[in-house]
Each structure stands twice: as C-alpha cells, then as structure tokens.
C-alpha cells in the first residue's frame, strides 16, 4: 500500500531464546530507530502491528494471537511467548502506523535448544572478575519484566552441569552469585534458572554466562618492555638482514587499548623511505595479561640504516614507555691473507 519507512532487518539484534521458556521481546523501533516511545505513539493514535516470516520462507504472515493459553500475545510494545517453541524461529517485524505515518523494522529471533548441561548454540555474555580482589558478584541477567515484584521466584545456580553448593568461594544469593575471592579455577560457564508461577503454570528462565578471571587492577603496572634492552646489541654488516623484536608485557586493564609502535629517527616507519616491514604477534596469559611482539625487519640493511635510532614505544591506560635498540655496524674482520703477508714482511 502507501509508503512505509522500512528500517530493514536489524541484525544487530540477533535475539536468541531457549525453547520451552518465556520470552519478552520489545519492538526495536522505540529503542533504536524512533525518537519517541510507545506511550507517546499510542496516545498519538498510532497502532503497533506485528507479523513474521518463518525460517526458510519468504512469505510474511500475521502472528497468531489466538493460540491456546495465549501462548503468543502482545502487551504495549512487547511481544510475549509463554513459552517459545522451536518453530517460532524466524524474522519478526513490528510496524507502527496510522493513515498518514508508517515505520517498520524486522529482527531475527532464534529459538535454541539446550542439552542437559545447559550447552547450546547461544552466544554467551562474558563477565570478567578480578583475580583475588575481594567479594565480586554476578547477577542473573535479562530477567526483568517477566514477573511482578510480588512474585518470589526460586533461583538455582549451576557451574557447568552442577548445582553450586558447598563451593569454597562461590555462594548463591538469590539473583546474585558471590565470589568471595575469584581464582583461575572459577573460570567457566555459570547458569541461573529462575522458576516462577503465573496463572497456575510454572515457567523457567535459563540464563548462562561465561566467567573469566582476569588480572586485578591492584597488580596492574605500566607497560614493560622486555626487548629491546641494554644487554643485546644488534651488530650487522651492510647487506645483512636486521631483525629487532620489540616485546612488551601489558597488565590486564579493563577497556584499555594496548599499543606498540616503532619509530626510526623519531618518525613512524610509514613516514620514511627505507624498506622496513613490521610483523606483530599477541599472546595472553591465563588472566588476560598481554604480551605483544612487533618485529622490525630490514631485509638488506645499509650503513646509513645502521646509524639510525630505532625506538620501541608502548602505551596503555597505565602509562607510556619507550626503549631504544642498540644498533651498530659490525667492524669487518681483518682479511687473513693480507695480514699474514704483512706479518712475514712481504711487499
């Protein structure tokens, strides 16, 4: 019919939900695309319409809101599944319209199966805990709005397959899981299952997240340059290959950008004419401390190159450091035959 502002398929919102569990999905129009909320739209006489395209089909069809026990329903700007089924997977569209205005967006919904240990194709959020940092908590995510505050759900926490009980340093406290002192052994997948009653039925919400124990800010230091250092001299003859590694250790710092770069005579390698290549490799410790190595390479070094200043620089949120490499031209070894001849008094 008439023109509609189509925001297309919002793949940024790849929604994954577990089979046989309730799901509440807000229309993304009001969250990401329009400058007004549902209440404003509703009071202005706009109607929100939902429809969907099944997986592996092209045909858009209306959502059946007349299923037994109101399995799928709409409430304001939320589409409810109580509960989901595997074949609910597809692209869902919410359209806001009246006679003069129309705007719509689609988003993919994937209903996912889990196994007996809560493993599934679900993309898991990662929660980082600082090692040996004191009490830290994780909270069962994305359960708001499923039941009123008057309902008291039960929450069971699992690590992998096993209920968390009698763990030395991990204590379930309702919606929170407390780590008294996080250790590397606490790395893993944690699942909370929230059970609540509604209209004579029992519903379950399963939420899994990955816990990664990382370096503590208490132990964080500015970058440490292990190489180049004062003990190694890069002595080369013209024509040889010059290889200088810059190896830098970075403490883990949340949201820190770690950088390593070379300067040659105070300039970035890109800004000078010599034929230089730089290769970088990165490795991580178990607590996500980072070691970056940048190898500066000049295939056929000239005597001019051997007089230049080669400095490795490193920067993190903790500070900036630099270290010059000791580069020098190798003094050629005396030619044996000439020396010998001279030694015997030959002319």
């Amino acid at each position: 019919s008439e023109r509609c502002d189509d925001w297309g398929l919002d793949t940024m919102r790849q929604i994954q939900v577990f089979e046989d569990e309730p799901a509440r999905i807000k229309c993304p129009l009001f969250e990401h695309f329009l400058k007004f909320n549902y209440s404003t739209a509703h009071s202005a006489g706009l109607t929100l319409i939902w429809y969907w395209t099944r997986q592996d089909r092209d045909l858009e069809e209306p959502i059946n809101f007349r299923l037994p026990e109101n399995r799928i329903s709409k409430e304001k700007d939320v589409l409810w599944f109580r509960p989901t089924l595997l074949n609910d997977t597809g692209n869902y569209t919410c359209m806001l319209r009246n006679t003069t205005y129309c705007s719509k967006v689609a988003f993919p919904l994937e209903v996912v199966q889990k196994d007996s240990c809560f493993n599934s194709p679900m993309k898991l959020p990662v929660h980082k805990l600082y090692i040996e940092y004191g009490i830290q908590r994780i909270t069962c995510p994305n359960v708001d709005g499923y039941f009123p505050s008057s309902v008291k759900p039960t929450i069971t926490w699992y690590m992998g397959c096993y209920k968390i009980q009698n763990f030395n340093n991990v204590i379930p406290e309702g919606m929170n899981l407390s780590f008294l002192i996080a250790l590397i052994s606490n790395n893993g997948n944690y699942t909370c299952v929230v059970t609540y009653p509604e209209n004579g039925r029992t519903f379950h919400l399963t939420r899994t997240l990955t816990v990664k124990v990382v370096g503590s800010p208490k132990n964080a230091v500015p970058p440490v340059i292990h190489s180049p250092n004062d003990h190694v001299v890069y002595e080369k003859e013209p024509g040889e290959e010059l290889l200088i590694p810059c190896t830098v250790y970075f403490s883990f710092l949340m949201d820190s950008r770690n950088e390593v770069w070379w300067t040659i005579d105070g300039k970035k390698p890109d800004d000078i004419t010599i034929d230089v290549t730089i290769n970088e490799s990165i490795s991580h410790s178990r607590t996500e401390d980072e070691t970056r190595t940048q190898i500066l390479s000049i295939k056929k070094v000239t005597s001019e190159d051997l007089k230049r200043s080669y400095v490795c620089h490193a920067r993190s949120a903790k500070g900036e450091v630099a270290k010059a490499a000791k580069v020098k031209q190798k003094v050629p070894a005396p030619r044996y035959t000439v020396e010998l001849a001279c030694g015997f008094g030959a002319t």
Epitope: F18, E19, D20, L85, Q113, D115, S116, T156, K163, N166
Partner: antibody
C-alpha cells in the same frame, strides 16, 4: 497442559523383564528431565533414575544400576523404563515424573507391575 | 546416599488446625528440598520446591521453611481435601531420596 500417560498394568515372571512407557504431551519433551520413581504396596517412594531426552543423558540410582535402562523416543515424545531380572520385591507401582530442573513437576498415573511365579 | 527422616509418620488433626510435618536430612542439603502430596490411589503431586517455593496452583495454606538439615511443611488451616500422605525429597545430591512419608488424617 502437561500430561504423562503410562502404559497398562503388567504381570511378569521372576527373572523376566518389563518395559513401561510414558507418553508426554503439553510441553517440550526434549527440554525436561524424565524421572522414574517406584512405590511398593503400602510403602514410600523410591527414585530409580532419570533421562534428558534432548541429549539422552541418564543418571541411575546405584541400587538399580545395570538392571534398569531408561530410553526416550523424541519422535513420539515417549520415555521408556526397562527393568530386567525381575524379582518379587520389584512388585510396585512405577511412575514417570517430568521436571524442567530437578523437582518432579508432573507425574504419570502410574503402572502396576506384579512379579509372581 | 542422603537419608531423609520424616516425622511424625502419621497424624490426626481437626479441620482448621495448623499442621506441621518435619523432615531431617543426614547432611546439609542447601534448601534443595521438595514436598509432594499423594492422595490414596493417586500419583504424587509437587506442592513445594526449593524449601519454600509454592508450585503453581497450590493453595497458599501450604508453606515450607527450613535450612541446613531441618525442614518443615506447614498447613496453616487443615481442609478435608488435604487428607493424604506427604513426602519430602532432597535434590541436593544424586540419587534423589525421599522421606518415609507422613499420613495426615482428619479427626
């Protein structure tokens, strides 16, 4: 709503086997545990084991290990409990019980198995 | 295996009475305790999960409490339809184990 319908009563000879079925409807069969519990006449409840039809994972009580086999047919949403080497003390009502987690939320009506020579 | 001991094994009370059944575990079960109701000739029904969580559709006169090894089921005002045998069950550690049951009758 959730329904678990079990097969009918069985009379078996000592040393033989029995296979009890439990057909599930009203929920996603592959997403919940199916437990098996028995109750001897006039006695209490005894947990035998459980199966997760989604991946076939099973847990058995030590007492029944090697004598009980739990299986599930996803295509028909039916769980089975087979008990072998029957003896007179296996005479009991056998229940299937569905649980999304560990509590058994819903139970079948029970199947009486009588072991008699 | 964890042993579950229920008491009393039977009780008789009047309609409207407050009834308490206790369940003791041989070791701490971290609140992983269910209560089931079984009426004569019927399958058990889940009443309470995780010590105090009322199962959907269960009347609010039923409540559960406890921690560690000791747990309680309370019927605040006994009704004729509550005549049944009540079982506690731990689900802390496999194998799941049940108490011996408490038979509740009306005086």
């Amino acid at each position: 709503q959730v329904q678990l319908v079990q097969s009918g009563a069985e009379v078996k000879k000592p040393g033989s086997s029995v296979k009890v079925s439990c057909k599930a409807s009203g929920y996603t069969f592959t997403s919940s545990w199916m437990n098996w519990v028995r109750q001897a006449p006039g006695k209490g409840l005894e947990w035998m084991g459980r199966i997760y039809p989604g991946d076939g994972q099973t847990h058995y009580a030590q007492k029944f290990q090697g004598r009980v086999t739990l299986t599930a047919d996803k295509s028909t949403s039916t769980a089975y409990m087979e008990l072998s080497s029957l003896r007179s003390e296996d005479t009991a009502v056998y229940y299937c019980g569905e649980g999304y987690l560990d509590p058994m939320d819903y139970w079948g009506q029970g199947t009486l198995v009588t072991v008699s020579s | 295996d964890i042993q579950m001991t229920q008491s009393p094994s039977s009780l008789s009370a009047s309609v409207g009475d407050r009834v308490t059944i206790t369940c003791s575990a041989s070791q701490g079960i971290n609140n992983y305790l269910n209560w089931y109701q079984q009426k004569p000739g019927k399958a058990p029904k889940l009443l309470i999960h995780y010590t105090s969580g009322l199962h959907a559709g269960v009347p609010s006169r039923f409540s559960g409490s406890g921690s560690g090894t000791d747990y309680t089921l309370t019927i605040s005002s006994l009704q004729p339809e509550d005549v049944a045998t009540y079982y506690c069950q731990q689900y802390s550690i496999l194998p799941w184990t049940f108490g011996g049951g408490t038979k509740v009758e009306i005086k």
